[in-house]
Interface confidence: low
Amino acid sequence: SGPLPKPSLQALPSSLVPLEKPVTLRCQGPPGVDLYRLEKLSSSRYQDQAVLFIPAMKRSLAGRYRCSYQNGSLWSLPSDQLELVATGVFAKPSLSAQPGPAVSSGGDVTLQCQTRYGFDQFALYKEGDPAPYKNPERWYRASFPIITVTAAHSGTYRCYSFSSRDPYLWSAPSDPLELVVT
């Protein structure tokens, strides 16, 4: 009959967690599950419960998590991995817009994330978007060019900096930058 379908794993309120702040990981499978297993990859930590509450985020808790469930003697496929990121580990970068934060529709703008540290990775978030701009050509660079700006690009942006050596330990977020498309 094949393996059971994979559950979903989410972090509430967000998978970006400031140090010392709480977060809840929730594994969701079908009704009537016999047993859940929630584990932190690359470690020996796991629990046989669907909900993991972290009352105060620590550096050591950042990383990749996944979960699965058991019905009878059958185990499900594992959930998609969840990347739990600790933020505020390093000082915030600065975010600026070139040539400026007000741009005409159809124009070009580049969002530039700058840090005093020698970080090699940067993430750019737009408020309301569920995930960062993570395209490979943007992910590894401090500049995020937006070609042919539209009204949809209007909004509040923040960036983070971090190192590829510790990809789940991020800086504090930059001060917000308001991009206005006229």
Partner: nanobody, 120 residues
Framework: QVQLQESGGGLVQAGDSLRLSCAAS????MGWFRQAPGKEREFVAA????????NYADSVKGRFTISRDNAKNTVYLQMNSLKPEDTAVYYC?????????????????WGQGTQVTVSS
């Protein structure tokens, strides 16, 4: 890394009271375990991060009370009506899972232990 430091152990007579303290370098779900000579480590009590939930071993229910002061990052074990069979090294432990578990495997961090001896 979480640092846990127990204090308050000592030698008392049966029927006396003791209060153990555990200072933690962070706020976690916490537990107390004990280990008597030649025996396995056993669960005593646990308390949730907020202090709203507790769990006790049957052998200490009604005699021991676990509590916490999050402002001081300290957990307490008030032990009343002590018996000779309560003699053990008492260990404070911290869990990243807020489930007041009685399972040793649920606890990630451990203190060095404090000796409690109850004479008859």
């Amino acid at each position: 890394q979480v640092q846990l430091q127990e204090s308050g152990g000592g030698l008392v007579q049966a029927g006396d009271s003791l209060r153990l303290s555990c200072a933690a370098s962070g706020t976690y779900s916490m537990g107390w375990f004990r280990q008597a000579p030649g025996k396995e480590r056993e669960f005593v009590a646990a308390i949730s991060w907020s202090g709203g939930r507790t769990n006790y071993a049957d052998s200490v229910k009604g005699r021991f009370t676990i509590s916490r002061d999050n402002a001081k990052n300290t957990v307490y074990l008030q032990m009343n009506s002590l018996k000779p069979e309560d003699t053990a090294v008492y260990y404070c432990s911290a869990a990243i899972y807020d489930n007041v578990s009685s399972r040793i495997g649920s606890y990630t961090y451990w203190g060095q232990g404090t000796q409690v001896t109850v004479s008859s």
